[in-house]
């Protein structure tokens, strides 16, 4: 008799999930010698322990604490780049500007980036068929709780000037319901963070509007100001040129506004 299995609305665990996490851990420690003290097997065991045999709608931040402890990492607190709805450009940027870090440049973010995972209550099986969707099923699912936990810790660690890359092509350039809007903004520490600088990335070639005047950006400014953190905003009119100028700052065309 086949066992009844809960059908969730979201995609199932990424295929070869355990091997992928283990392989990424090995790869990360290879690239980052400062993390070579990490025991990747222990990291996997802690990751697995956070969600295996647990109801995938009943995951807590506490479940991830053993993993958080093993993945503790010091990044320069004044070199943090947050992003919202524009991950690829943010990652391209930190690949060039090697002294700046997104969450996915840290071990834990790197391990989980673009992956989905969940288990089932009372069985040691990973569910490769379906996992809970944040909207349609539940918010306390393994993936959402993981990102909420690591995002909170990342924001709490930030200091001095924190940068955030925002997608100027979206109807809500700043979205209160995004991870940035709902978690990171509220966990920046005013006693450590002096300024949040937003970089609004333009999509259209001929878009010369000042998107820093967008109502949602004004809303972000208001939230940040109320938290006693200064706010500044820059338009990045030409993201392609912006990246090129990060690579080659001496280029004569890089003195003009990007």
């Amino acid at each position: 008799v086949p066992r009844w299995r809960q059908q969730w609305s979201g995609p199932g665990t990424t295929k070869r999930f355990p091997e992928t996490v283990l392989a990424r851990c090995v790869k990360y420690t290879e690239i980052h010698p400062e993390m070579r003290h990490v025991d990747c097997q222990s990291v996997w065991d802690a990751f697995k322990g956070a969600f295996i045999s647990k109801h995938p709608c009943n995951i807590t931040e506490e479940d991830y604490q053993p993993l958080m402890k093993l993945g503790t990492q010091t990044v320069p607190c004044n070199k943090i780049l947050l992003w919202s709805r524009i991950k690829d450009l943010a990652h391209q940027f930190t690949q060039v500007q090697r002294d700046m870090f997104t969450l996915e440049d840290t071990l834990l973010g790197y391990l989980a980036d673009d992956l989905t995972w969940c288990g089932e209550f009372n069985t040691s099986k990973i569910n490769y068929q379906s996992c809970p969707d944040w909207r349609k099923d539940c918010s306390n699912n393994p993936v959402s709780v993981f990102w909420k936990t690591v995002s909170r810790r990342f924001a709490e660690a930030a200091c001095d000037v924190v940068h955030v890359m925002l997608n100027g092509s979206r109807s809500k350039i700043f979205d209160k319901n995004s991870t940035f809007g709902s978690v990171e903004v509220h966990n920046l520490q005013p006693e450590k963070v002096q300024t949040l600088e937003a970089w609004v990335i333009h999509g259209g070639r001929e878009d010369s509007r000042d998107l820093c005047q967008d109502p949602t950006i004004k809303e972000l400014e208001s939230i940040i100001s109320k938290r006693n953190i200064q706010f500044s905003c820059k338009n990045i009119y030409r993201p392609d040129k912006f990246l090129q100028c990060v690579k080659n700052p001496e280029d004569s065309s890089c003195t003009s506004e990007i």
């Epitope: 283990l22 851990c25 090995v26 003290h37 025991d39 990747c40 097997q41 065991d45 697995k48």
Partner: nanobody, 122 residues
Framework: EVQLLESGGGLVQPGGSLRLSCTAS????????MSWVRQAPGKGLEWVSG????????YYADNVKGRFIISRDNSKNTLDLQMNSLRAEDTAVYYC???????????????RGQGTLVTVSS
């Protein structure tokens, strides 16, 4: 180029002991999990034991648990397998392998050495 060189095999009587060693080169030894697998004459490959990259976690097949001890020295790039209370059924070619680790069901292996023969016979 990854190289794994096993040594320490030989003929031993039932109940006896043997210590296998594996010297690794061509990769960052300390970031890889390591394991021992074996192949008995006319049989398939069988996973024997594994150890995590920092040596924190060790794993054993049920039929060697309590008799074999796996260890590693990351400063010397070496992996050892201390085999005690050897039985005739332990006769096999023993291979050292580097990999990603153990997920509870599967040992993820990347590279394997040439092997060393262990014969348990009176």
């Amino acid at each position: 180029e990854v190289q794994l060189l096993e040594s320490g095999g030989g003929l031993v009587q039932p109940g006896g002991s043997l210590r296998l060693s594996c010297t690794a080169s061509g990769f960052i030894f300390s970031i890889y999990a390591m394991s021992w697998v074996r192949q008995a004459p006319g049989k398939g490959l069988e996973w024997v034991s594994g150890i995590s990259n920092r040596g924190v976690n060790t794993y054993y097949a049920d039929n060697v648990k309590g008799r074999f001890i796996i260890s590693r020295d990351n400063s010397k790039n070496t992996l050892d397998l201390q085999m005690n209370s050897l039985r005739a059924e332990d006769t096999a070619v023993y291979y050292c392998a580097s990999g990603k680790g153990w997920d509870g069901n599967t040992w993820y292996e990347d590279y394997r050495g040439q092997g060393t023969l262990v014969t348990v016979s009176s």
